[in-house]
């Protein structure tokens, strides 16, 4: 039984140019957590594997930084990285748990982060 | 050691599919990239595409989308890659390769003898 | 896409001879950030499959010898071997994995005069 909750940035604002922090945190489980996943809709961004580490792909390796933690950081904002975004946390036992954040990147000055949510 | 074991030869007519398999031992196999290399005498390497076991996250030449559609069985640790509509131009030895994963991605350490495939009437 | 040129396409040597092939990129394959040539070297006899011999440009595989060295830094790469034996008649193939899709040169094949 996955009884797991996946905590999020939620929806998240950014400045075209800046960094932003995608944050996931598995939580309410005893599960071993084996590898994340971060994908920008269908697209691989970084996998965090627990015994090998991270593996960033290339298509993304100028402007993604692994971490803090089983985070990821986005560099050199464009208004193109508007979307949704995805941790997918491969557990043993539980399977797997996917978390969505929805980054919005403005062109003006006014980017403020949006409240935190749970997705169970 | 790391050992990928290819599939054998195939001939096979203008038109219709194929599917090849490599089967990878000596490592955990969710953990790492598999590649395809196709080599035609006279046009040397050319690289088809990768997959992750592990998430079954693929990329791809553009020229080769459409053509190859690479999967891999995670219970069987074997790889496998479909090509369609295949044609005299499809003629070629295809390798698997160990793409590896991190700071050893991209490069191949490890290759398959190799899947002949020769299109023919 | 990243093109990769390699020179000359065939190489006449003798044993015992210092031999130097080149391999130029369309776009350079330094990364900034960490300062790494992302070019493999590969080596292939007839009949067999390729075989890693370099990456990053200059680190050699295990169980390559010391005699072959790669170098270069950013598109202009070479790959000498300081005096060639017979077992190192083959093709040599340089590769680029910077960016998708990752691309091969042409070859240069080492035979003998």
């Known amino acids: 039984m996955m009884t797991g909750t996946i905590e999020t940035t939620g929806n998240i604002s950014a400045e075209k140019g800046g960094s932003i922090i995608l944050q996931c945190h598995l939580s309410s489980t005893t599960a071993q957590v084996t590898q994340v996943n971060w994908e920008q809709q269908d697209q691989l961004l970084a996998i965090c594997n627990a015994d090998l580490g991270w593996h960033i792909s290339p298509s993304f390796k100028d402007r993604v930084a692994p971490g803090p933690g089983l985070g990821l950081t986005l560099q050199s904002l464009t208004v193109n990285d508007t979307g949704e975004y995805f941790c997918i946390y491969h557990t043993y036992p539980d399977g797997t748990y996917t978390g969505r954040i929805f980054l919005e990147v403005l062109e003006s000055s006014v980017a403020e982060h949006g409240a935190r949510f749970q997705i169970p | 050691q790391v050992q990928l074991q290819q599939s054998g030869a195939e001939l096979v007519r203008p038109g219709t599919s194929v599917k090849m398999s490599c089967k990878a031992a000596g490592y955990t196999f969710t953990n790492y990239w598999i590649g395809w290399v196709k080599q035609r005498p006279g046009h040397g390497l050319e690289w088809i595409g990768d997959i992750y076991p592990g998430g079954g996250y693929t990329n791809y030449d553009e020229k080769f989308k459409g053509k190859a559609t690479l999967t891999a069985d995670t219970s069987s640790r074997t790889a496998y890659m479909q090509l369609s509509s295949l044609t005299s131009e499809d003629s070629a030895i295809y390798h698997c390769?160990?793409?590896?994963?991190?700071?050893?991605?991209?490069?191949?350490?490890?290759w398959g003898a190799g899947t002949t495939v020769t299109v023919s009437s | 896409d990243i093109v990769m040129s390699q020179s000359p396409s065939s190489l006449p040597v003798s044993v015992g001879e210092k031999v130097t092939m080149s391999c130029k990129s369309s776009?350079?394959?330094?990364?900034?950030?960490?300062?790494?040539?992302?070019l493999a070297w590969y080596q292939q006899k007839p009949g067999q499959s390729p075989k890693l011999l370099i990456y990053?440009?200059?680190t050699r595989e295990s169980g390559v010898p010391d005699r072959l060295t790669g170098s270069g830094s950013g598109t202009d790469f070479t790959l000498t071997i300081s005096s060639v034996k017979a077992e190192d008649l083959a093709v040599y193939y340089c590769q680029q994995y910077h960016k998708y899709p990752f691309t091969f040169g042409g070859g240069t094949k080492l035979e003998i005069k």
């Open positions: 776009q350079s394959l330094l990364f900034s950030s960490d300062q790494k040539n992302y």
């Open positions: 390769v160990n793409g590896g994963y991190g700071s050893t991605y991209g490069y191949f350490d490890v």
């Open positions: 990053w440009a200059s």
